[in-house]
């Protein structure tokens, strides 16, 4: 559309230039041309002349009516056919928009990624509104009652420097557009409970040349958090089923995890951690691929029979992809509950 044009008259929209999608809309054009008594007044939508539902109200004014207008944006303009003029004369133009009031933001989550210096809050915005919609994030200290507000489009990063006054906050999100306003549910946040440890990285893996070969996976994190609880998932690249093992980790040194795996197979490993007893997980680390060595002698292979040395692992769970056509989407088929959380929670998946 054209943001500003010199009008020789007026154009107005009922119920307004921004309205709810699906509403009936009337657009009026009133000419104020000098030296012209128009034979006809014409309406154009996005540059195309309209043919139907146009009413000439009087000498200077016409109206076009749309039943159930459902285009998110349109540029309307109207013209006059003046006697003696070869071309139509522009009267006025308007940008019009249709959309929806916002849904109440849902699934509000706030986390502090270790070393980031920010509290990051995200939420689900709901169905598309098609019009400019802003989100006001309210952060209210439960200790001082002071409230801060931040404008956002889809998420917000709030400097922890501005959260020095207290540790406990109430957070909620207000969605606002021209057609309405909705509030999310309130989230109680304790800054000490929402820290996600610095990223965990698998640095290398090796398979020993023992009678019963074992694979040692080395992994690390720069976290300063003392008590960290981690999961490592692994599978062959040809398999759809992940096995998941748990560990209590102390990152003052590089972690070593031992696995007894199928020989001559390509395995994918990923790890994620959380502060022990807390809710928020890291995303899964980048996939680390390791090829186990070939079997040297025949033996009965029992993948789960040997102990997992150096670790306090407890349970192995299996996570299976929905279908071979959607390897990115994983879901728990038989979830073993690990210390109060399912292995499927909050994960980033690869096939």
């Amino acid at each position: 559309g054209i943001t500003s044009i010199n009008c020789s008259g007026d154009m107005w929209v009922e119920p307004g230039e921004i309205f709810q999608m699906g509403m009936n809309v009337s657009i009026y054009c009133q000419e104020a041309l000098k030296h012209c008594r128009p034979r006809n007044l014409y309406f154009y939508k996005n540059g195309f002349k309209e043919e139907f539902d146009i009413t000439r109200i009087n000498r200077t004014t016409a109206r076009i009516w749309y039943k159930g207008f459902s285009e998110p944006h349109a540029y309307m303009h109207c013209t006059a056919e003046c006697p003696g003029h070869f071309q139509e004369t522009l009267i006025c133009g308007k940008d019009i928009s249709s959309g929806h009031p916002p849904d109440a933001p849902s699934n509000l989550t706030c986390v502090i990624y270790e070393y980031s210096g920010n509290m990051t809050c995200t939420w689900n915005t709901g169905k598309p509104t098609y019009i400019d919609t802003k989100y006001i994030v309210h952060v209210k200290s439960l200790e001082t009652e002071e409230e801060q507000q931040y404008l956002a489009s889809s998420y917000v990063k709030i400097s922890t420097d501005s959260l020095q006054g207290s540790r406990k906050y109430l957070v909620w999100v207000q969605a606002v557009n021209s057609l309405g306003m909705e509030n999310s549910q309130q989230l109680h946040v304790h800054l000490d409970d929402i820290v996600i440890p610095s990223a965990s990285i698998i640095s290398r893996a090796e398979t020993t040349n023992d009678t019963v070969p074992k694979t040692i996976v080395y992994w690390k994190s720069k976290t300063m958090i003392e008590k960290v609880f981690c999961e490592m998932r692994y599978k062959t690249t040809t398999n759809q089923t992940w096995s998941v093992k748990e560990f209590d980790a102390n990152f003052t040194y590089v972690q070593q995890s031992e696995f007894y795996l199928e020989p001559d197979s390509k395995y994918v490993f990923q790890v994620r951690c959380q502060e022990t007893g807390k809710r928020n997980w890291q995303p899964w680390s980048s996939p680390f691929v390791h090829q186990t060595s070939q079997e040297t002698g025949k033996r009965n292979w029992q993948p789960w029979s040997s102990p997992f040395v150096h670790q306090t692992s407890q349970t192995v769970s299996q996570v299976t992809a929905k279908s071979s056509h959607e390897p990115q989407k994983m879901e728990m088929l038989s979830a073993t509950i690990f210390r109060g959380h399912p292995a499927s929670g909050n994960h980033q998946d690869i096939g």
Epitope: Q148, Q149, Y150, L151, S162
Partner: nanobody
Framework: QVQLQESGGGLVQPGGSLRLSCATS????????MRWVRQAPGKGVEWVSG???????IYADSVKGRFTISKDNAKNTLYLQMNSLKTEDTAMYYC??????????GSQGTQVTVSS
């Protein structure tokens, strides 16, 4: 306690410009979101524009593209630059804490009159 003092209003012709100021004290201005609202004679309070502590802004459709809200944390002052003024912008203008809302509390306001 919180104090807000608006200034900069006046009489201006349609198409003209004004810059409103809101001097503040009694709270941590740099961490506080602020807004402008207005009240035309015989009408309700209308929210105009808001700005958060990081400087992100939001505007009512009726003023979008014509008004600009800003804040100077060093001076603890909120501003509203009003261009291409229309007769329907005639109102008493108030500043308030918070990005959004059609209320204000206790400040005296500044009168803006747009007339030819």
């Amino acid at each position: 306690q919180v104090q807000l003092q608006e200034s900069g209003g006046g009489l201006v012709q349609p198409g003209g410009s004004l810059r409103l100021s809101c001097a503040t004290s009694g709270f941590t201005f740099r961490l506080t979101a602020m807004r402008w609202v207005r009240q035309a004679p015989g009408k309700g309070v209308e929210w105009v524009s808001g700005i958060d502590s990081a400087g992100s802004t939001i505007y009512a459709d009726s003023v979008k593209g014509r008004f600009t809200i800003s804040k100077d944390n060093a001076k603890n002052t909120l501003y509203l630059q009003m261009n291409s003024l229309k007769t329907e912008d005639t109102a008493m203008y108030y500043c308030a804490q918070g990005v959004y809302g059609d209320t204000y509390s206790g400040s005296q306001g500044t009168q803006v009159t747009v007339s030819s």
